[in-house]
C-alpha cells in the first residue's frame, strides 16, 4: 500500500577542503535559472566521483546550498553563485538544507492538517 509522501527538512554545516580538482560538484539555480518553481535558490545537481564533496560524503544531490563561508546565496545570478564557489578559498564552509523524503502512513489515514475530507 502506498503512503503519502512528506519531506523532512534539516540543515547542516559542511566544511570541505578543496581537493586537487576542486570541490567536486555541480550546481543549478539562481535568479536567472530557476530550477525549482518560485525558488531562485542554488541546488546541488551532481556530486563528482572521488571529488572533495564525494569523499566527505555529507553533501547530496538535491541539497539546497544556503550560504558559502557565511555569505548568503539568496537572490544571486547563476554565474555569480558559480564565481562565489570558485573564489571561496581552500577551506569552504557550506550551510546546506537536506530534504529527506519520508513515508507518512498508508493512504486512507487522514492525519491532522490533511486537506482532504
Amino acid at each position: 500500500m502506498n503512503g503519502r509522501v512528506d519531506y523532512l527538512v534539516t540543515e547542516e554545516e559542511i566544511n570541505l577542503t578543496r581537493g586537487p580538482s576542486g570541490l567536486g560538484f555541480n550546481i543549478v539555480g539562481g535568479t536567472d535559472q530557476q530550477y525549482v518553481s518560485n525558488d531562485s535558490g542554488i541546488y546541488v545537481s551532481r556530486i563528482k566521483e572521488n571529488g572533495a564533496a564525494a569523499l566527505d560524503g555529507r553533501l547530496q544531490e538535491g541539497d539546497k546550498i544556503l550560504s558559502v563561508n557565511g555569505q548568503d546565496l539568496k537572490n544571486l545570478l547563476h554565474q555569480d553563485a558559480v564565481d562565489l564557489f570558485r573564489n571561496a578559498g581552500y577551506a569552504v564552509s557550506l550551510r546546506v538544507q537536506h530534504r529527506l523524503q519520508v513515508q507518512n502512513g498508508p493512504i486512507g489515514h487522514r492525519g491532522e492538517g490533511d486537506p482532504s475530507g
Partner: nanobody
C-alpha cells in the same frame, strides 16, 4: 535519464561546411552545460567545443578556433555545431555531451569525465 540524439553529419569536400545538431530530452535543458567531442579512428576522444547553460560562455579547442561555432537554443532543447572551412583532419565521429548544472570548480570542460550523458555520435567525413 537524458537522451541525446545527434544529426547533421555526412560527407563533405575540404573547405565545405556542415551543421551538427544535438537534441536533448529533459525539462531542465536550460540548466545543462554541454560540449562537442570527436573521435577519429584509432585516436582518443578529443574535446571540440563547450557552451555554458545560457549560451553566453563558449570555449573551443585550438584546432577548431575561428572555424567552428557552438550555439544552443534552449527553447528547442537543441545544441548546434556550425563547422566551416572543414579539413580532412576534421574527419571523425562527433559526439555531444551533457553535464547537469555548472561545475563550481574552474573550467574543466575539455575533460570527458566532466560530462554525465553522451550521444551515439554522428560521422563527419571530409575528403
Amino acid at each position: 535519464q537524458v537522451q541525446l540524439v545527434e544529426s547533421g553529419g555526412g560527407l563533405v569536400q575540404a573547405g565545405g561546411s556542415l551543421r551538427l545538431s544535438c537534441v536533448a530530452s529533459g525539462r531542465t535543458f536550460s540548466t545543462y552545460t554541454m560540449g562537442w567531442f570527436r573521435q577519429a579512428p584509432g585516436k582518443e576522444r578529443e574535446f571540440v567545443a563547450h557552451i555554458g547553460w545560457s549560451g553566453s560562455s563558449t570555449y573551443y579547442a585550438d584546432s577548431v578556433k575561428g572555424r567552428f561555432t557552438i550555439s544552443r537554443d534552449n527553447a528547442k532543447n537543441t545544441m548546434y555545431l556550425q563547422m566551416n572551412s572543414l579539413k580532412p583532419e576534421d574527419t571523425a565521429v562527433y559526439y555531444c555531451a551533457v553535464a547537469i548544472g555548472s561545475p563550481v570548480d574552474s573550467n574543466r570542460h575539455s575533460d570527458p569525465l566532466e560530462y554525465d550523458y553522451w550521444g551515439q555520435g554522428t560521422q563527419v567525413t571530409v575528403s
